[in-house]
């Protein structure tokens, strides 16, 4: 079985998680992409997704999550602003490719959010000031309900991240739940 690697980010409340998911330009530039959370023993939940087809450099904001798909870079940028302790968890980027199952982009992100802002005097990002300035054209895309008939795969435990490296592609088989969060205006 393929082992999944994780990259860990330990941030303080109010800070921003800012990660980029690399994908194959030729195959996936216009494909719909999503940001998911994987809770212990549960199926991945889609928190936000790009439009279908995915638009270049067009921010999509769902609550405190902002997705931007840069076709020219082959990167999906994911930002979670004003982090809260309860945002802690395991996250991943996936690409929807119906009728096939979603394609996972490595590596997963283990986010740990702790109390107390990690600022320094003069810092210009704090819990009430760090929400990204998103263009007024920001939209919320509808995420497909992506269900597989296969057996649910158990999510990895919250223990230390496995440092071994994946050697083959992984297709998700257990995406069934969609979280819908109001858009910030």
């Amino acid at each position: 079985a393929t082992k999944l690697t994780e990259e860990k980010y330990e941030l303080k409340e109010g800070q921003t998680l800012d990660v980029k998911c690399d994908y194959t330009l030729e195959k996936f530039a216009s494909s719909q992409k999503a940001w998911q959370i994987i809770r212990d023993g549960e199926m991945p939940k889609t928190l936000a997704c790009t439009e279908r087809p995915s638009k270049n450099s067009h921010p999509v904001q769902v609550g405190r999550i902002i997705l931007e798909d840069y076709h020219d870079h082959g990167l999906l940028r994911v930002r979670m602003v004003n982090l809260q302790v309860e945002d802690s968890g395991l996250y991943q980027c996936v690409i929807y490719q119906p009728p096939k199952e979603p394609h996972m982009l490595f590596d997963r992100i283990r986010l740990v959010v702790t109390k107390g802002f990690s600022g320094t005097p003069g810092s210009n990002e704090n819990s009430t000031q760090n929400v990204y300035k998103i263009p007024p054209t920001t939209t919320k895309a509808l995420c497909p309900l992506y269900t597989s008939p296969r057996t649910v795969t158990q999510a990895p435990p919250k223990s230390t991240a496995d440092v071994s490296t994946p050697d083959s592609e992984i297709n998700l088989t257990n995406v069934t739940d969609i979280i819908r969060v109001p858009v910030f205006n």
Epitope: T5, E7, Y9, E10, L11, K12, Q15, T16, L17, D18, V19, K20, C21, D22, Y23, T24, L25, D72, H73, G74, L75, L105, F106, D107, I109, S118, N124, E125, N130, T165, P166, D167
Partner: antibody, heavy 119, light 108 residues
Framework: EVQLLESGGGMVQPGGSLRLSCAVS????????MSWVRQAPGKGLEWVSE????????YYADSVKGRFTISRDNSKNTLYLQMNSLRVEDTAIYYC????????????WGQGTLVTVSS | EIVMTQSPATLSVSPGERATLSCRAS??????LAWYQQKPGQAPRLLIY???TRATGIPARFSGSGSGTEFTLTISSLQSEDFAVYYC??????????FGQGTKVEIK
Amino acid sequence: EVQLLESGGGMVQPGGSLRLSCAVSGFTFSRYAMSWVRQAPGKGLEWVSEMRGSSGSTYYADSVKGRFTISRDNSKNTLYLQMNSLRVEDTAIYYCAKEFSSNSLFDYWGQGTLVTVSS
Amino acid sequence: EIVMTQSPATLSVSPGERATLSCRASQSVNSNLAWYQQKPGQAPRLLIYGASTRATGIPARFSGSGSGTEFTLTISSLQSEDFAVYYCQQFYNWPPWTFGQGTKVEIK
């Protein structure tokens, strides 16, 4: 164990060319972005070039744009830096570095190879 | 291009003392900042990323803080092996990825 081993450095005259190689092992090379970072003698670190993993996108510092070309051979687990029209100010130790999957920060570095450009 | 400025250029500290290194970005990089340690004749080593996350195998005496434009690397009790040059690097937005000019931590 992750390993990166640079080679190809040496002495060259201004205007000359060199090709650096970085052989890697211990991780799935094709998945990760890789960068070249250099350090002039007694100076600080300067990012030179990056090549993404899945997308293959390439980026260059302004100081080398049009003269250097980054490439990779995923079947050989090797990263390259073709350096043309070399200048005296290109003299440095050149490191190849593996990046995080999720951001351009460098979690593994090679030992470096010295490039000396002198007449 | 985002310019990273480190201070002081040199920090003289006695073993066992606390060392505080600063890094300032010319514009906000949020938490997209890393710290590296480099000893003479060696390649840099990743210490901290995401402004505050310790890299694998890095001792707890190293801690990072800050966000936006102001960042700090703290070494709580300097050990002999900690005397080295430290660099900050921003990885916000797109290349070029830029480093600070470095802070040399030397024995007082």
